[in-house]
Interface confidence: medium
């Protein structure tokens, strides 16, 4: 999915600079030139996580790596929505241990709207007895689900317990698209 | 379906103090604030404040400062009132209103009726 | 402390349209003031209408719609039946705080 997304994308910045060179050509010969074919811009974010992240919400890498950002804006570990519509939401946080203990673990992706007087849980992952005392142990927790969404939504994710999380880009994201 | 079931009518002496609860189901509990409303006889309806059920943070109208109190039984998915120092102007019906994804007031309790006299 | 004005009382027939409308006295009612209307039926069984203006509570019938009309909020109830005959509220938010208005007593006739 993240792939034809990326492929997609790429396809767009393509077909839109081919478009540029074209017309610019056009109209040099004097030919008139067609409407350009309008494809919009489709609405989708990947973000990976962030080691830095220090308290929560979480914050997400934006910029370098496997990240998507596009119709869709990334604020202080939030992404906001500026298209009311229906959304696919999904993140999925990897915990680790060096030695089992057992600590409750939750993952939620929650929201967050002026028109809204308190944050709303949208998808909530939670884990207890998961591995043996005193072992290493790793798990992952992953949410995913479809969503209407309003303009100026604000969505993040937070965890129970940061210093079990890694933060590597393939194990630990938060991401949506537009339907 | 969504349900706020409130506590049963209450008849207290000037001075006392009354509890209301109102248990919510049908929904998750924690996701929308709680609001309370008092209606007086042969007078309008009063918003007296609301609770955030995520952090258990009460936010109260300037007239209902001092004497009343919200706070949660978050497991039992419970709002609760308390009103001390009973007035007789505290006979009213009190209703337990939740908030909906928006500035929305879309489900209330069928309300507790509480008369002070002496 | 804002005052909100309702029309004390409307009468309307079946199937008739009717708005009920509620004014602010601070002026206009904005989108900002997220505009509430609440039913009441005797013994004080109260539902929630409409929210923000003009979001429909969940399972009120299409035939309840919120809007803003002038300087005003207003519900319409197109297609009256006999049993919207109730006490509508409506209740406007100032920055941290509800009013709710006097009430506008609807008979169907």
């Known amino acids: 999915q993240l792939f034809h997304l990326q492929k997609e994308l790429a396809e767009l910045r393509e077909s839109t600079s081919q478009m540029h060179t074209a017309s610019s050509l056009e109209k040099q010969i004097g030919h008139p030139s067609p409407p350009p074919e309008k494809k919009e811009l489709r609405k989708v974010a990947h973000l990976t996580g962030k080691s830095n992240s220090r308290s929560m919400p979480l914050e997400w890498e934006d910029t370098y790596g496997i990240v998507l950002l596009s119709g869709v804006k990334y604020k202080k570990g939030g992404l906001v929505i500026n298209e009311t519509g229906l959304y696919f939401v999904y993140s999925k946080v990897y915990f680790r241990g060096q030695s089992c203990n057992n600590l409750p673990l939750s993952h939620k992706v929650y929201m967050r709207n002026s028109k809204y007087p308190q944050d709303l849980v949208m998808m909530e992952g939670k884990m207890m007895s998961y591995c043996t005392t005193g072992q290493m142990w790793a798990r992952s927790s992953y949410l995913g689900a479809v969503f209407n969404l309003t303009s100026a939504d604000h969505l993040y994710v937070n965890v129970s317990e940061l210093s079990l999380v890694n933060f590597e880009e393939s194990q630990t994201f938060f991401g949506l698209y537009k339907l | 379906q969504i349900q706020l079931v409130q506590s049963g009518p209450d008849l207290k002496k000037p001075g006392e103090t009354v509890k209301i609860s109102c248990k919510a189901s049908g929904y998750t509990f924690t996701n929308y604030g709680m609001n309370w409303v008092k209606k007086a006889p042969g007078k309008g309806l009063k918003w007296m404040g609301w609770i955030n059920t995520n952090t258990g943070e009460p936010s109260y109208a300037e007239e209902f400062k001092g004497r009343f109190a919200f706070s949660l039984e978050t497991s039992a998915g419970t709002a609760y009132l308390h009103i001390n120092n009973l007035k007789n102007e505290d006979t009213a019906t009190y209703f337990c209103?939740?908030?909906?994804?928006?500035?929305?007031?879309?489900?209330w309790g069928q309300g507790t009726s509480v008369t002070v006299s002496s | 402390q804002a005052v909100v004005t309702q029309e004390s009382a409307l009468t309307t027939s079946p199937g008739e349209t009717v708005t009920l409308t509620c004014r602010s006295s601070?002026?206009?009612?904005?989108?900002?003031?997220?505009a509430n209307w609440v039913q009441e039926k005797p013994d004080h069984l109260f539902t929630g209408l409409i929210g923000?203006?003009?979001n429909r509570a969940p399972g009120v019938p299409a035939r309840f719609s919120g809007s803003l009309i002038g300087d005003k909020a207003a519900l319409t109830i197109t297609g009256a039946q006999t049993e919207d005959e109730a006490m509508y509220f409506c209740a406007l938010w100032y920055s941290n705080h509800w009013v709710f208005g006097g009430g506008t007593k609807l008979t169907v006739l």
């Open positions: 601070t002026g206009a009612v904005t989108t900002s003031n997220y």
């Open positions: 923000d203006t003009n």
């Open positions: 209103v939740k908030y909906s994804r928006y500035y929305a007031m879309d489900f």
